[in-house]
């Protein structure tokens, strides 16, 4: 029977700069029941506080609700592990909420085959930003990435959509079922998880005759890029 091993705070994330959660990994338990507590103070303060919510984020977590989250202050936190034989402390972690934002994935992903009479057919993809993020305040700029592939393909084709919430893709294999997903990231922060896959059957008469494929960030002022088939494979397959 031993004192507990050193815990480690390994991740802090905020969905929207208004709340955040940190998670720790326990060290060895020393063969005894072990209690964990997270304490923190804000930079420039000496008063220590205990984690306000150990429940919301699941096991080995601390959740900071709105009233405990300040954007303009750095949090200095550590985890204390205690059993009957003694205690151990994690290293201190410095957390600035601005830089730990990981949004929820975008919503309402819609995929449609468009076959205008006067133009080439294309796949039209659109989505909505995650609900927790208020883009109107200007606090956030979200960037988007789309990935798609034929159902049985192992490789995804990835397209960067910038700040657009719509995208057109012309180079597709007719007669295949495609999976499409989208994710987002703030200018400072982490990519969201990919959204659940949406799928669409590409009609067998979806034809591309030109060896050049037009990929457009929608005709809403988005810059159109003319990309050759060769460039497409080099730049968009990950």
């Amino acid at each position: 029977q031993l004192p507990p091993g050193k815990p480690e705070i390994f991740k802090c994330r905020s969905p929207n700069k208004e709340t955040f959660t940190c998670w720790w990994r326990p060290g060895t338990d020393g063969g005894l029941p072990t209690n964990y507590s997270l304490t923190y103070h804000r930079e420039g303060e000496t008063l220590m506080h205990e984690c306000p919510d150990y429940i919301t984020g699941g096991p080995n977590s601390c959740h900071f609700g709105k009233q405990y989250t300040s954007m303009w202050r750095t949090y200095i936190m550590m985890v204390n592990a205690t059993n009957q034989m003694g205690s151990s402390f994690s290293d201190e972690l410095y957390v600035d909420v601005t830089y730990i934002v990981q949004p929820d994935p975008p919503l309402e992903l819609a995929v449609e085959v468009k076959q205008p009479e006067d133009r080439k057919p294309y796949l039209w993809i659109k989505w909505s930003p995650p609900t927790l993020i208020d883009l109107k305040t200007g606090w956030f700029t979200l960037l988007y990435e789309i990935r798609l592939k034929p159902e049985k393909a192992a490789e995804w084709e990835i397209h960067f959509a910038g700040q657009q919430t719509e995208f057109k893709i012309l180079s597709l294999h007719p007669g295949q079922k495609y999976l499409v997903q989208v994710r987002c990231k703030p200018d400072h922060g982490y990519w969201s998880a990919w959204s659940p896959a949406t799928f669409i059957q590409i009609p067998s008469d979806f034809t591309m005759n030109d060896e050049q494929k037009l990929i457009s960030e929608e005709d809403l002022g988005g810059e159109q890029k003319l990309i050759s088939e060769e460039d497409l494979h080099h730049h968009h397959h990950h």
Partner: antibody
Framework: QVQLVQSGAEVQKPGASVKVSCKVS????????IHWVRQAPGKGLEWMGN????????IHAQKFQGRVTMTGDTSTDTAYMELSSLRSEDTAVYYC???????WGQGTLVTVSS | EIVMTQSPATLSVSPGERATLSCRAS??????LAWYQQKPGQAPRLLLY???TRATGIPARFSGSGSGTEFTLTISSLQSEDFALYYC?????????FGGGTKVEIK
Amino acid sequence: QVQLVQSGAEVQKPGASVKVSCKVSGYTLTALSIHWVRQAPGKGLEWMGNFDPGDGETIHAQKFQGRVTMTGDTSTDTAYMELSSLRSEDTAVYYCVGVTFDYWGQGTLVTVSS
Amino acid sequence: EIVMTQSPATLSVSPGERATLSCRASQSVASNLAWYQQKPGQAPRLLLYGASTRATGIPARFSGSGSGTEFTLTISSLQSEDFALYYCQHYNNWPLTFGGGTKVEIK
């Protein structure tokens, strides 16, 4: 023809863990993100989580936080779902499901009983 | 999480008649909705995805409509093999959730 074949029925005691396997054929696991869904006797369907073998990412329902682990072995095209700290309410048929929902495993009955 | 509500819980219909099943989402799921059929002792079977696209091998008597929060599954002329449980499920965002199911029984 795509097939998902699951491991056999299990009986476990409360507090134990169970690991259900799902062998993919007619497809490579790297191409197939896997959902796990369960159904308690006489009840409806409940989504547990998703495992993407391509990047190893997992997403799960909040109620399973800290109890469910989804993994995959691309060399054998097999996905796994492990549920720990079992309780009687976890007695259910567990299904693995292909990403487009049209391929389902046959189901694995897990019974939790002392 | 999005709550999916199916109605009615049980629908009694005579063979050859039309059956209309409803599914409501607590917030918009666009067209990211699937319908399943499940028979006793079997895994569910995908009927429709994208709210209205029939899955491979599904007969034309099954059709779906709706987008946003209100969805309908219609079976135009019920065959004996259609008496089963039906579930809707959204895949708009995480977590995915299912409706509670509608049992279609012989009248």
